[in-house]
C-alpha cells in the first residue's frame, strides 16, 4: 500500500495509523477502528471510514425529481460491519440485536427486524443524486463553468472516472450532481461512486478526510462556491423493501448539511 514515504501518513485518509512496518520498511496505514490496511493512493471505503469515525472521540424544471425509491440517510451514524474488502455487510445489527439490510453505501433499505432478518445480498447503489444549495454569491455562476469545475473536482480530488459523473444540473441556488455506476461498469481500481459521494459530503461539511489539506476551496472562474445545505439521495439497482406504513409516513426534513437517505421514485 502506498503512502507518503517521507513522514509516513496517508494522503487520502487522515483517520489512519501509519508506520513503516510494511514490506521493506515501507509505510503502511491501517484504518482506525478496524485495523484494516488501506490503499492510500485512492479513497478509503465508506464502511471503513464510518467505522473509524465511530471509534474516534465524539465531536422550467431542469432539476431532477428524486424517484420514489430514492433513499435518504435518516438514520445517521452507526458502527458498521465491513467485509474483508472494506465493503458494507448486507446485514447490519446494533448492540441490542436490532438488524436491518443496507445497500452498498451503508444506507438502510428495509424495516428494522431482529437477528432472524435475512439480507441475501448487498444491493448496489447505482445512482446517487447530490443536491446542494449554495450561498448567495456576489457573482453569478455560469452553468457550463460550474459543470466543468465540479467534473474536474470529482476527477482530480476524488479520482472518480469522468464517465461516472452523469450530469450536473443548476437552477440557482440549487446544484445537483448525478453520479451513476452500474455493477457492470465498475472496473477493478475504479473509485466507487458511494465513496466519492461520501468524501464530497464530508468536504462540504468542512470535515475533510484528506490528510493535512485545508478545507475544500471550490471556485468557478475565481468566484468561491459556498454550500449552505446538502441532501444526498441514493437509488439502488433493486428497489428497497419498506412496509407501507413507512412509505406513507411523510417526508423527511432537510436541514443544513443533513443527507437524508430517502426512497423516492422516477
Amino acid at each position: 500500500h502506498t503512502a507518503a514515504q517521507d513522514n509516513c501518513t496517508c494522503p487520502t485518509n487522515k483517520m489512519t495509523v501509519c508506520s513503516p512496518d510494511g514490506p521493506g520498511g515501507r509505510c503502511q496505514c491501517r484504518a482506525l477502528g478496524s485495523g484494516v490496511a488501506v490503499d492510500c493512493s485512492t479513497l478509503t471505503s465508506k464502511c471503513l471510514l464510518l467505522k473509524a469515525r465511530m471509534s474516534a472521540p465524539k465531536n422550467a424544471r431542469t432539476l431532477v425529481r428524486p424517484n420514489e425509491h430514492a433513499l435518504v440517510d435518516n438514520d445517521g451514524l452507526y458502527d458498521p460491519d465491513c467485509d474483508p474488502e472494506g465493503r458494507f455487510k448486507a446485514r447490519q445489527c446494533n448492540q441490542t440485536s436490532v438488524c436491518w439490510c443496507v445497500n452498498s453505501v451503508g444506507v438502510r433499505r428495509t424495516d428494522k427486524g431482529d437477528l432472524s432478518l435475512r439480507c441475501d445480498e448487498l444491493v448496489r447503489t447505482h445512482h446517487i443524486l447530490i443536491d446542494l444549495r449554495h450561498r448567495p454569491t456576489a457573482g453569478a455562476f455560469n452553468h457550463s463553468d460550474l459543470d466543468a469545475e465540479l467534473r474536474r473536482l470529482f476527477r482530480e480530488r476524488y479520482r472518480l472516472h469522468p464517465k461516472f459523473v452523469a450530469a450536473v444540473h443548476y437552477e440557482q441556488p440549487t446544484i445537483q450532481i448525478e453520479l451513476r455506476q452500474n455493477t457492470s461498469q465498475k472496473a477493478a481500481g475504479d473509485v466507487d461512486i458511494g465513496d466519492a459521494a461520501y468524501y464530497f459530503e464530508r468536504d462540504v461539511k468542512g470535515e475533510s478526510l484528506f490528510q493535512g489539506r485545508g478545507g475544500l476551496d471550490l471556485r468557478v472562474r475565481g468566484e468561491p462556491l459556498q454550500v449552505e445545505r446538502t441532501l444526498i439521495y441514493y437509488l439502488d439497482e433493486i428497489p428497497p423493501k419498506f412496509s407501507m406504513k413507512r412509505l406513507t409516513g411523510g417526508g423527511s426534513g432537510g436541514g443544513s448539511h443533513h443527507h437524508h437517505h430517502h426512497h423516492h421514485h422516477h
Epitope: R135, R219, G222, Q226
Partner: antibody, heavy 122, light 106 residues
Framework: QVQLVQSGAEVKKPGASVKVSCKAS????????INWVRQRPGQGLEWMGW????????KYAQKFQGRVTMTVDTSTSTVYMELSSLRSEDTAVYYC???????????????WGQGTLVTVSS | EIVLTQSPATLSLSPGERATLSCSAS?????IYWYQRKPGQAPRLLIY???NLASGIPARFSGSGSGTDFTLTISSLEPEDFAVYYC?????????FGQGTKVEIK
Amino acid sequence: QVQLVQSGAEVKKPGASVKVSCKASGYTFTSSDINWVRQRPGQGLEWMGWIYPRDGSKKYAQKFQGRVTMTVDTSTSTVYMELSSLRSEDTAVYYCATRFATVVSNYGLDPWGQGTLVTVSS
Amino acid sequence: EIVLTQSPATLSLSPGERATLSCSASSSVNYIYWYQRKPGQAPRLLIYDTSNLASGIPARFSGSGSGTDFTLTISSLEPEDFAVYYCQQWNSYPLTFGQGTKVEIK
C-alpha cells in the same frame, strides 16, 4: 506565515500609469484570490477588484473598468495592479489583500499588504 | 451598489468600557466582515461571516446581526483597541465598505 509584500511609493504625473506589485509568500499562491483596495486621504476603503491566480479570472469594480488591469506571475507568486490615465483623485494608499475561502466559509480579506502610496501630482 | 452606513461616526469611550458599533446595509446582505485599522497600518480582519472570529483576534471582539443590521461589540476596551473600524459586504459587486467608526479614548 502568510505575507503580502508590496512595491514602494510612486509619484506620477496626471495621465500617466502606475504599476504596483504584490508578492505573496507562506501559502499556495494559486489557492486564493488577491484583491486590491485603496484608501484616499481622509476617505474610506474602496474596493477595486480581484484576480484569481489559478486561472487568471478577474473581477473589476465598474468604477475602474477600462482603467485598471490586474495581472499575475505565478512563477514569482506576484500580482500586479496597473492603473492608467491617472488623475489627482487617484492619490491614495493602494493595498493588496488575499481572500481565502472554502465551501463552508468566506474568510474575508486577510492578510493585507503594507500598502503602497501613489501620489499623482503635476 | 449596496451602501453600508456605520454609526456612530465617532465613539468616545474609556478603557474597560463596552463598545457597540453598528453597520446598516441599504439592502439585505447575508454576511458582514469587520476590519480594524490603526494609523500607518494596513487594515486587519476581525470578524468573518458576520460572527466568526478571525485567527489571532481576542475573544472580546464579537459580531452579530442579519439582514440589514449588523453589530460589532468589544466587550471591554483595551488600550490597543482604539482605532477605526470598517464593515464590508461580499453580497454583490462592487464589494463595499462602510465609512468607518472611530473609537477614541474619552
